[in-house]
């Protein structure tokens, strides 16, 4: 967690409609998809895995939007607009779980927010979201 | 409450700050119902490019 007592996730969740998805044999096609040209760089990818049934698990990887190294500039530098968005969730209480990306509470909230934005902006030129951070209100 | 901060990426020229905020506000009710998230105090701003996750980490509005 950062000095501002927040949890952070720096991955781009892609809009599945804007990129061709590659899947592993165990996976199904999901909106949390990754363009095929990223598939050879598994070490830089964050994995989103959701248990669905005893016989199958959803897996998909999402590429990082940015690197934490200042000198590396994203490949998306041309033809892309970025917007910083913040909002309060008034019916949730901040607790230490939201400082730790490995907790169920963190992952559930991140998943819900990611899915929500993928749906709200699925019309038009939405490419994805990244750098989700949680902090006390 | 919990404050959520994130970055949205769009193809250039397809949307502006005002429309990002308007569209999000339009679905706050659905968000409350579908995801049990009661959303308020929405703020949207342009992000100057280039930027990185680290440099943006303490950007609070």
């Amino acid at each position: 967690a950062s000095g501002s007592a927040s949890g952070s996730a720096s991955t781009l969740v892609h809009n599945g409609t804007s990129a061709r998805a590659t899947t592993t044999p165990a996976s199904k096609s999901t909106p949390f998809s990754i363009p095929s040209h990223h598939s050879d760089t598994p070490t830089t990818l964050a994995s989103h895995s959701t248990k669905t049934d005893a016989s199958s698990t959803h897996h998909s990887s999402v590429p990082p939007l940015t690197s934490s190294n200042h000198s590396t500039s994203p490949q998306l530098s041309t033809g892309v607009s970025f917007f910083f968005l913040s909002f309060h969730i008034s019916n949730l209480q901040f607790n230490s779980s939201l400082e730790d990306p490995s907790t169920d509470y963190y992952q559930e909230l991140q998943r819900d927010i990611s899915e929500m934005f993928l749906q709200i902006y699925k019309q038009g030129g939405f490419l994805g979201l990244s750098n989700i951070k949680f902090r006390p209100g | 409450s919990v404050v959520v901060q994130l970055t949205l990426a769009f193809r250039e020229g397809t949307i502006n700050v005002h429309d990002v905020e308007t569209q999000f506000n339009q679905y706050k009710t659905e968000a409350a119902s579908r995801y049990n998230l009661t959303i308020s105090d929405v703020s949207v701003s342009d992000v100057p490019f280039p930027f990185s996750a680290q440099s943006h980490h303490h950007h609070h509005h």
């Epitope: 599945g16 199904k28 096609s29 999901t30 909106p31 949390f32 989103h48 959701t50 248990k51 669905t52 959803h58 998943r111 819900d112 899915e115 929500m116 749906q119 709200i120 699925k122 019309q123 | 339009q26 679905y27 009710t29 659905e30 409350a32 119902s33 579908r34 995801y35 049990n36």
Partner: antibody
Framework: QIQLQQSGPELVKPGASVKISCKAS????????INWVKQRPGQGLEYIGW????????KFNEKFKGKATLTVDTSSRTAFMQLSSLTFEDSAVYFC???????????????WGQGTSVTVSS | QILLTQSPAIMSASPGERVTITCSAS?????IHWFQQKPGTSPKLWIY???NLASGVPPRFSGSGSGTSFSLTVSRMEAEDAATYYC?????????FGGGTKLEIK
């Protein structure tokens, strides 16, 4: 045409578990949410929760957390609900119903399965 | 969670009669849906977003309301309209249903 076909009736003992299925056809399974609704004999409708087949994400009515588990198998276009530690109060007809993501959420649950009767009896 | 109260619980109407069923919410909601259910069958979406008729619903049905007060009206009752009608809100999680109104034909 669009259909949700549910599995057949179940007679189970108290304390056991049961898994019922809902097979979708006639639309893109991963595009729509699947909701589950409970109806006890002669009673009204009670919302259990939803699952989004596109991601496997789900959310429950607090009352059914720990009682119901929602899963999907996208290869067979089937949603499942498992009910555990069954009691007599779990005897009911359980329906699956599809609905829409944003921005079409306000269309409501437009197609329903025929229902699966679960009877808990010793 | 939001409580939906339907009234009346049971009512009878003669063919051709005008019928109104009400649904009252414990807190303000954006819109409601109405479902029709006949014995031994699954519910059918009947009216969505307060006032829009679902596919195949006869035009003698209508829906209206806002805030905490909503209604379903049948302009001229017919035998096939005999069923139980449920209202549902989805403005607040979890979605909730009204207790139902059983509409009978005289």
């Amino acid at each position: 045409q669009i259909q949700l076909q549910q599995s057949g009736p179940e007679l189970v003992k108290p304390g056991a578990s049961v898994k019922i299925s809902c097979k979708a056809s006639g639309y893109t399974f991963t595009d729509n949410y699947i909701n589950w609704v409970k109806q006890r004999p002669g009673q009204g409708l009670e919302y259990i929760g939803w699952i989004y087949p596109g991601s496997g994400n789900n959310k429950f009515n607090e009352k059914f957390k720990g009682k119901a588990t929602l899963t999907v198998d996208t290869s067979s276009r089937t949603a499942f609900m498992q009910l555990s530690s069954l009691t007599f109060e779990d005897s009911a007809v359980y329906f699956c119903a599809r609905d829409y993501p944003f921005p079409s959420y306000h269309y409501g649950m437009d197609y329903w399965g025929q229902g699966t009767s679960v009877t808990v009896s010793s | 969670q939001i409580l939906l109260t339907q009234s009346p619980a049971i009512m009878s109407a003669s063919p051709g009669e005008r019928v109104t069923i009400t649904c009252s919410a414990s807190s303000s909601v954006s819109y409601i849906h109405w479902f029709q259910q006949k014995p031994g069958t699954s519910p059918k979406l009947w009216i969505y977003s307060t006032s829009n008729l679902a596919s195949g619903v006869p035009p003698r049905f209508s829906g209206s309301g806002s805030g905490t007060s909503f209604s379903l009206t049948v302009s001229r009752m017919e035998a096939e309209d005999a069923a139980t009608y449920y209202c549902q809100q989805r403005s607040s999680y979890p979605p909730t249903f009204g207790g139902g109104t059983k509409l009978e034909i005289k």
